[in-house]
């Protein structure tokens, strides 16, 4: 079975500073997989930010990086200059 | 047991396209990345670029302009295009299986064709 | 110039220990990339010889090994013999590029 395991539960981020989070792949290849990146905010909304390769929601594309570490079979989701707005909970799913 | 095999013409005039087929004998093509390779007489290894089963690919950035590699699963294959080459671009070129190896936390090469010598002249 | 360093060549005699460097740096092997090293005996394709820095495939004879201190790995041969006389490749991934895969120069080991 596959499983997607983020790297940590709760990441600190300082205003302006770029943020990296990881979602590792657990049981499979991850590059046979298209990887996806949510937010889910305060009003339980679950917002699309990203899927493989180079496809953003409205309005993420420009502070968002999505990308795979395919030698360490994670999912990467950088946050370029993360403000108050980008506060949340971030999942990452994975498709074929 | 595995087989990779190269095919392709041995022999491609400047300014033309390199085009090499690699099949894949012994396990379905899904489950794994597949690479190609190439050597010039002499010299080291050279990555050229890798593409997985869902279609998306990475290319070595000194090659990413001439570059197309696409996968056919029905037919256990994969293939290369180079385009634009010239006499620096003859080399053998290998394909190679690339697994990810969920024990170990390791991807590596494990499997590769016997190579194909591909000569650009006019 | 390849972005993993490794001597041109390296020798010794039949049943001695030789070892291949190679050097990489905070992208490759220091960003906790793991290395494979690689056999390629003259005319051949090459054959996986370690992964993860220290593990050797089904069939791969002890007598071969790999450490990892730093951003730099080693690949030992102990009982040299002389079927062992090959080019030996190191080669890892750089974080630079997605899945940008990199190798050394290659050393060729001489029996004598």
């Known amino acids: 079975a596959i499983e997607l395991v983020p790297e940590h539960q709760t990441v600190p981020v300082s205003i302006g500073v770029p943020a990296t989070l990881r979602c590792s792949m657990k049981g499979e290849a991850i590059g046979n997989y298209y990887i996806n990146w949510y937010r889910k905010t305060q009003g339980n909304t679950m917002t699309f930010i990203y899927r493989e390769k180079d496809i953003y929601g409205p309005g993420f594309k420009d502070n968002f990086q999505g990308d795979i570490d395919i030698a360490k079979n994670l999912a990467v989701l950088k946050i370029l200059a993360p403000s108050e707005r980008d506060e949340g909970s971030y999942y990452c799913a994975c498709d074929t | 047991q595995v087989q990779l095999q190269e095919s392709g013409p041995g022999l491609v005039k400047p300014s033309e396209t390199l085009s090499l087929t690699c099949t894949v004998s012994g396990d379905s093509i899904s489950g794994y990345y597949w690479n190609y390779i190439r050597q010039p007489a002499g010299k080291g290894l050279d990555w050229i670029g890798r593409i997985f089963t869902t279609g998306n690919t990475n290319y070595n950035p000194s090659l990413k302009s001439r570059v197309t590699m696409s996968v056919d699963t029905s037919k256990n294959q994969f293939s290369l295009k180079l385009t634009s080459v010239t006499a620096a671009d003859t080399a053998v070129y290998y394909c190679a299986r690339e697994r990810w190896d969920s024990s170990s936390s390791a991807l590596y090469f494990d499997y590769w064709g016997q190579g194909t010598l591909v000569t650009v002249s006019s | 110039q390849s972005v993993l360093t490794q001597p041109p060549s390296v020798s010794g005699a039949p049943g001695q220990r030789v070892t291949i460097s190679c050097t990489g740096s905070?992208?490759?092997?220091?960003?906790?990339?793991?290395i494979k090293w690689y056999q390629q005996l003259p005319g051949t394709a090459p054959k996986l010889l370690i992964y993860?820095?220290?593990n050797r495939p089904s069939g791969v004879p002890d007598r071969f090994s790999g450490s990892k201190s730093g951003t730099s790995v080693s690949l030992a041969i102990t009982g040299l013999q002389a079927e062992d006389e090959a080019d030996y490749y190191c080669q890892s991934y750089d974080s630079s590029m997605s899945g940008y895969v990199v190798f050394g120069g290659g050393t060729k080991l001489t029996v004598l």
């Open positions: 993860g820095n220290s």
């Open positions: 905070s992208s490759n092997i220091g960003a906790d990339y793991d």
